[in-house]
């Protein structure tokens, strides 16, 4: 869930990294309550994840793997 | 080599509640995920939910939601899953299995299954 | 939530026949597709993963093929061991739902 360019609480749903094309993270701040991944999926849709959930950690550590060899 | 021992097959009353168990050997505990899947007399696979052990997440089918607790003992390798205000319909073969990302998010080991019958 | 539809529900082959079996997502899954095989009274093991990847120790008679909505598994030479209900399982997303299963019986 987000509102504007904040999410406003985490996804209650694991995703494949196969549905991943990308992610920003979200740090907590005046504007933004909490800390996240913002997951952006093949379908357009930005997905809000908890950075310290070990299924997230696992995509992001992927997705930068992918991005460091280009 | 990698085993999962579920607890014995239990008779429960309607509304009662359930605890079946899920023993993990051979393998590093916390570096898989757990599933719950069970199967009705005659019926297909049912998927129910998920637990992480290494960080106690858990996503539960909406089905299940408010009815089902999975819980982790990481001292003995030990998954629980417990449903309550058991109905006739939740007479089924309770199933844990090792959830691996490694291949594709498969369920790659399974126990051998635990019988819960539901009968007044 | 995914729906996984399989057909057909059930099937009569003989030993040697080639079969195959389909799953269709009411969404495109990406490939984020699982097969199981189930023998009555025991446990589902897993066959292919990632729609096309043999799990290990299974044999090569078995395979894997699809894309987006649309899965396939085909055994090109039945043995009698193989005679057993079969599983499509969508993980793209949570909840990892399976398809109502495909019995493999003997003509």
């Known amino acids: 869930a987000s509102n504007f360019d904040c999410c406003l609480r985490y996804t209650d749903r694991i995703l494949h990294p196969k549905f991943i094309v990308g992610f920003t993270q979200q740090l907590a701040n005046e504007t933004c309550d909490i800390n996240a991944v913002i997951f952006h999926t093949k379908k357009g849709l930005s997905v809000c994840a908890n950075p310290k959930q070990t299924w997230v950690k696992l995509i992001v550590r992927r997705l930068s793997k992918k991005i460091n060899k280009m | 080599q990698v085993q999962l021992v579920q607890s014995g097959a239990e008779v429960k009353k309607p509304g009662a509640s359930v605890k079946v168990s899920c023993k993990a050997s051979g393998y590093t505990f916390t570096n898989y995920w757990m599933h719950w899947v069970r199967q009705a007399p005659g019926q297909g696979l049912e998927w129910m939910g998920v637990?992480?052990?290494?960080?106690?997440?858990?996503t539960y089918a909406q089905k299940f939601q408010g009815r089902v607790t999975m819980t982790v003992d990481t001292s003995t390798s030990t998954v629980y899953m417990e449903l309550s205000s058991l109905r006739s319909e939740d007479t089924a073969v309770y199933y844990c299995a090792r959830g691996n990302y490694g291949v594709d998010y498969a369920m790659d080991y399974w126990g051998q299954g635990t019988l819960v019958t539901v009968s007044s | 939530d995914i729906q996984m539809t399989q057909s057909p529900s059930s099937l009569s082959a003989s030993v040697g026949d080639r079969v195959t079996i389909t799953c269709r997502a009411s969404e495109n899954i990406y490939g984020a597709l699982n097969w199981y095989q189930q023998k009555p009274g025991k446990a589902p093991k897993l066959l292919i993963y990632g729609a096309t990847n043999l799990a290990d120790g299974v044999p090569s008679r078995f395979s894997g093929s699809g894309s987006g909505r649309q899965y396939s598994l085909t055994i090109s030479s039945l043995q009698p061991e193989d005679f057993a209900t079969y599983y499509c399982?969508?993980?793209?997303?949570?909840?990892?739902?399976f398809g109502g299963g495909t019995k493999l019986e003997i003509k």
């Open positions: 637990i992480d052990p290494s960080d106690s997440y858990t």
């Open positions: 399982q969508n993980v793209l997303i949570t909840p990892y739902t």
